[in-house]
């Protein structure tokens, strides 16, 4: 019945490591029966593959069908509105979805105290969906870097920054006591991927953690 419905205004990916989510904006004045059809194209295989015929949400998890993202030339996705027998034109993602579009995160940060130093260990992401051989460190095997930010709480928005090139790091607290909070933002020096700040990890430093030397 032609293409009477308006198309979704925009379609885009928001991706973290093995967490590849397609999003779109709804058509104006959609009805309760409006849903969205999603299709995927893998570069090198020039045909569209239908993924979902009728999604009523405004996002779709494409991780399972893009598991080879990190070893491929990337993907494009398209979405159209469907309402009964009517459908809109397709709206296609306006950029290629490739490894470069994946926002880097860390899994968590572990902190401990040793002789006045805060020792940190960065846990890399370990997504359940990832194939066994596709670890963060095997895909981003070189030039991993981390921006470390530390602040003393409470009520403090002032951070001290440090850049490290390993998953283990140490921070000198200059003899201060109190609660210190650390966040980490990953990057890969040879790549353009954006990074996200981790969840804050905090640790209390008291006088007992300092060794007195004469």
């Amino acid at each position: 019945h032609g293409t009477e419905l308006p198309s979704p205004p925009s379609v885009w990916f928001e991706a973290e490591f093995f967490h590849h989510i397609l999003h779109w904006t709804p058509i104006p004045n959609q009805s309760e029966s409006t849903c969205y059809e999603v299709a995927l194209l893998r570069y090198g295989i020039e045909s569209w593959n239908s993924i979902s015929n009728c999604s009523q949400t405004l996002s779709y998890d494409l991780t399972a069908v893009t598991l080879d993202l990190y070893h491929s030339n990337g993907y494009r996705a398209r979405v159209r509105a469907v309402d009964g027998s009517r459908h809109s034109n397709w709206t296609v993602t306006n950029t290629r979805f490739s490894v470069d579009e994946v926002t880097l995160t860390v899994g968590s940060v572990n902190l401990e105290i040793h002789n006045g130093f805060i020792l940190g260990k960065i846990q890399l992401p370990r997504p359940k969906m990832a194939p066994a051989n596709d670890t963060y460190e095997s895909i981003f095997s070189h030039f991993r870097e981390y921006e470390i930010a530390i602040r003393k709480v409470p009520g403090n928005f002032t951070f001290t920054h440090k850049k490290v090139k390993h998953e283990n790091f140490s921070l000198l607290t200059s003899g201060e006591v109190g609660e210190f909070c650390v966040q980490v933002k990953p990057s890969v020096a040879s790549r353009s991927n954006k990074g996200m700040w981790s969840k804050e990890e905090c640790i209390s430093l008291t006088r007992q953690y300092f060794t007195v030397t004469n």
Epitope: H19, I21, P127, H161, C181, Q183, W197, K199
Partner: nanobody
Framework: QVQLQESGGGSVQAGGSLRLSCTVS????????MGWFRQAPGKEREGVAT????????YYADSVKGRFTISQDNAKNTVYLQMNNLKPEDTAMYYC????????????????????WGQGTQVTVSS
């Protein structure tokens, strides 16, 4: 194109109230650290309050605790700063900022840096 638009600034007497709004457009992450910062003439920009939109957790600078309240309306993509019992030292340009956080691993506020900033709204408190 990400845009943060502040509104609600103005002039008020000491002890009065104002409510600032920050509306985000062209921005998609549902999990963010949204913050309000301020800068008085000749001073450095300082953090005022932040909210983690993924969980509602809030954080305040000591100087505004008990007087200012940050809140969100996810349906309107808007963050508010309710400012009560205003003091002359609250006079500044107020800026809204946003930083996307991980959907998978979560995040915390404040973040050490913010990617997106508004143009600011002026607040003037006279004694």
């Amino acid at each position: 194109q990400v845009q943060l638009q502040e509104s609600g600034g103005g002039s008020v007497q000491a002890g009065g109230s104002l409510r600032l709004s920050c509306t985000v457009s062209g921005y998609t992450y549902s999990s963010n650290c949204m913050g309000w910062f301020r800068q008085a003439p000749g001073k450095e920009r300082e953090g005022v309050a932040t909210i983690y939109t993924g969980g509602g957790n809030t954080y305040y600078a000591d100087s505004v605790k008990g007087r200012f309240t940050i809140s969100q309306d996810n349906a309107k993509n808007t963050v508010y700063l309710q400012m009560n019992n205003l003091k002359p030292e609250d006079t500044a340009m107020y800026y809204c900022a946003a930083e996307p956080l991980s959907r998978v691993y979560g995040g915390s506020c404040p973040t050490p840096t913010f990617d997106y900033w508004g143009q600011g709204t002026q607040v003037t408190v006279s004694s």
